[in-house]
Interface confidence: low
């Protein structure tokens, strides 16, 4: 029989959980063979010397969400078997030197969501087997050189949500085994060249939500194994030509929410594994030829909410696998007829909230798999004959909020819309803007004879029928593009909670969670 403190529950004596506001000190006696101890949501304010002395077999210790503000240096004495220690979500401002001494088996140390203002090299000098160190959500302003020098086996380090303004180029120098480094939501304004040079096994680098203005040209040149690079929501105004040149494994790159004005050809790549590129909320004004040509496997390209007024005909060369293209909320007035010619696999395109006055008749000529086209809120008065005829998979077309000119020239479009009305959705239908006597009337049901009585109206629709009729039961599944719930940022797939916020803001990119990865 192994005793269980009255304030705790002991499931199979080796697992002990002590919770509740009535607990003000570490309960005793704890079962001597306890392997897992959780002390959660209590009013414990301090840990005295050696409160766990008699449970030397302990492997996991979680002391979380308490009022803990003070720990004696010998609090964890005799816990040589401990592999996991969490002190997260407490009120710790300082850590005594030597606190982790003797924890020779410790692999995971969680100190997140406290009020730590500094760490010192001596804090972790005994933790040579540590693989994971979580320090996010504290008040750290500076990491001293040498702080992590003894943690040569560390694979995951989270320093996010602190107040770091500067990172020493030496601070990560010994972390050759590090795979995940998170520095998101700090106040970093620049990162010295060489800072990441030693991180040859790094797979994820999170630098989003800082104040980084410039990136050194060779900043990532030694990080050949990098797979996920988050640079969103910074102040980056330009990308050095070679910045992404040696990242062959990269499969996610976020650059949204910066101040990028231009993208030079070849800036991206070669990145054969990159599937998504997020560039919305920048200041990009034009897209030159071949700017994305190295991204042969790219499936999602988000360029919305920029200031793009010109797209070179070869801008999308090489994007043969692209499925989603978001160009909404830019300053486009005209598009070259060949601009989408290479996008043979494109399924969804959003062009809403631009200034498009007309579209070339061949604009979608080679893009036979298009399922959704968003053209609402432009300056379109008419569309070329047969522009959608070959798009047999088209299931969502948005044309509202354009100044449609309902004269006799609109008839072919009107007749096609009549046959394909369900594709337009039920939320808002296109309405006439001119002539004045039909302004506000539905384009689909407008009587063109009333609008322009002097013009002869052919009795037979001149707009060819498409390959199928609007029988709603036969529509393809449109959930993947149903602009109902959208993301302001791609889901940055952290295992621990960081900064990702899902919102119902419909204005971001005209595509949905299903595409966000």
């Amino acid at each position: 029989y192994y005793g269980c403190p009255s304030e705790c529950t002991c499931s199979r004596a080796s697992q002990v959980e002590c919770t509740g506001a009535r607990i003000v000190a570490v309960p005793t006696p704890l079962p001597w063979n306890a392997m897992s101890l959780q002390i959660l949501n209590t009013h414990i304010t301090e840990l005295s010397e050696s409160p766990f002395l008699n449970i030397s077999a302990l492997i996991a210790l979680r002391i979380e969400k308490n009022e803990l503000s003070h720990i004696m240096p010998g609090a964890f004495r005799n816990l040589g078997s401990l592999r996991y220690l969490s002190l997260a979500n407490n009120k710790l401002q300082v850590l005594p030197i030597g606190l982790f001494q003797g924890l020779d088996s410790l692999e995971s140390l969680l100190l997140s969501s406290n009020q730590l203002v500094q760490i010192q090299p001596a804090h972790f000098s005994q933790c040579s087997n540590l693989k994971e160190l979580q320090l996010h959500g504290n008040h750290l302003e500076y990491i001293p050189d040498g702080a992590f020098d003894h943690l040569v086996g560390l694979t995951k380090l989270n320093l996010g949500k602190n107040s770091l303004t500067h990172i020493s180029p030496r601070v990560f120098q010994h972390l050759g085994n590090l795979q995940v480094l998170r520095l998101y939501e700090n106040r970093l304004t620049d990162i010295p060249m060489g800072t990441f040079d030693g991180l040859v096994n790094l797979q994820e680098l999170a630098l989003q939500q800082n104040q980084i203005g410039l990136l050194s040209p060779g900043l990532f040149h030694n990080n050949h194994n990098l797979q996920r690079l988050y640079l969103s929501n910074n102040h980056i105004s330009q990308l050095p030509p070679s910045i992404f040149m040696q990242l062959p494994q990269l499969n996610r790159l976020t650059l949204f929410g910066n101040s990028l004005k231009e993208l030079s050809p070849g800036i991206f790549g070669p990145m054969p594994n990159l599937r998504e590129l997020w560039l919305y909320d920048n200041h990009i004004t034009s897209l030159p030829d071949n700017v994305f040509s190295n991204l042969r496997q790219l499936q999602v390209l988000i360029l919305s909410r920029n200031q793009i007024s010109f797209i070179s005909p070869g801008a999308f060369n090489g994007l043969t696998e692209l499925r989603e293209l978001s160009l909404h909320t830019n300053a486009l007035q005209d598009l070259d007829g060949n601009v989408f010619r290479m996008l043979a696999n494109l399924q969804n395109i959003s062009l809403q909230n631009n200034r498009l006055r007309q579209l070339p008749g061949n604009i979608f000529a080679n893009v036979n798999g298009l399922m959704t086209i968003q053209l609402q809120n432009n300056q379109l008065e008419n569309l070329p004959l047969g522009i959608f005829d070959h798009l047999g998979k088209l299931c969502e077309l948005r044309l509202y909020d354009n100044p449609w000119r309902c004269d006799s020239d609109i008839l072919p479009l009107r007749n096609w819309l009549l046959l394909n009305q369900p594709r337009l959705g039920t939320d808002t239908v296109p309405v006439c803007f001119s002539p004045a006597n039909v302004r506000g009337q539905s384009l689909i049901i407008i009587n063109v004879n009333v609008a322009v009585p002097s013009v002869h109206v052919p009795e037979v629709p001149s707009y060819p029928e498409t390959s199928w009729y609007p029988d709603t039961s036969s529509y393809p599944d449109t959930t993947s593009i149903s602009s109902t719930t959208e993301l302001t940022s791609p889901v940055e797939d952290y295992t621990d909670l960081t900064t990702i916020q899902v919102t119902d803001d419909r204005s971001v990119w005209g595509m949905t969670q299903a595409q966000s990865g």
């Epitope: 180029p169 050759g176 060249m193 060489g194 030693g198 096994n201």
Partner: antibody
């Protein structure tokens, strides 16, 4: 006591490849970085590059196209190769322990002359 | 790359004199600066790192100061064994760069 010792030929012909090895004793090559630095007569010190025990490298851009540094952790050694040498590469070559910047231990240096 | 400019390029002083060498960086490097002493025919020796931290075993008459772009190495009382060339070195931003050196002689 940490010691570094350079070895390799003292004479190399123009257009050939200069090869040097640095043997580290008294310290594990698995900690810190390991650099090569050279000193040409009357020219001061020039950092060539460093290597990490994992194989990661960083080179001086002025030499990058010609230089390669490798590491052999089993022998506690690291090596320098400099291709297509000219007389301008004649110098004393030092290996040093690089604590990511400051070089706290240096080899004695070896003079390499490039001449036909 | 960061360029370090030392001044003077050479100086001559008497034993017991206070000697000052300056090093200016072409851009801010915080305190990531080291000083080395190289005696004739010998290997460079680390004197000071982090701009002002004395390396173990270095006599206390040597001191360093500065941050950003301007740095100083001071020998409070010059000794005969201090005859050498002194180099500053940037380690804020790779490539690591050295100043051109300051040669110190005894009058």
């Amino acid at each position: 006591q940490v010691q570094l010792q350079e070895s390799g030929p003292g004479l190399v012909k123009p257009s050939e490849t200069l090869s040097l090895t640095c043997t580290v004793s008294g310290a594990s090559i698995n900690i810190y970085y390991w650099s090569w630095i050279r000193e040409a007569s009357g020219k001061g010190l020039e950092w060539i590059g460093y290597v990490h025990h994992s194989g990661g490298t960083n080179y001086n851009p002025s030499l990058k196209s010609r230089v390669s540094i490798s590491v052999d952790t089993s022998k506690n050694q690291f090596s320098l190769r400099l291709k297509s040498v000219t007389a301008a590469d004649t110098a004393v070559y030092y290996c040093a322990r690089d604590t990511y910047g400051p070089f706290d231990y240096w080899g004695q240096g070896t003079l390499v002359t490039v001449s036909s | 790359e960061i360029v370090l400019t030392q001044s003077p390029s050479s100086l001559s002083a008497s034993v017991g004199d206070r000697v000052t060498i300056t090093c200016r960086a072409s851009q801010g490097i915080s305190n990531y600066l080291a000083w080395y002493q190289q005696k004739p025919g010998k290997v460079p020796k680390l004197l000071i790192y982090a701009a002002s931290t004395l390396q173990s075993g270095v006599p206390s008459r040597f001191s360093g100061s500065g941050s950003g772009t301007d740095f100083t190495l001071t020998v409070s009382s010059l000794q005969p064994e201090d005859v050498a060339t002194y180099y500053c070195q940037n380690y804020y931003s790779a490539p690591w760069t050295f100043g051109q050196g300051t040669k110190v002689e005894i009058k």
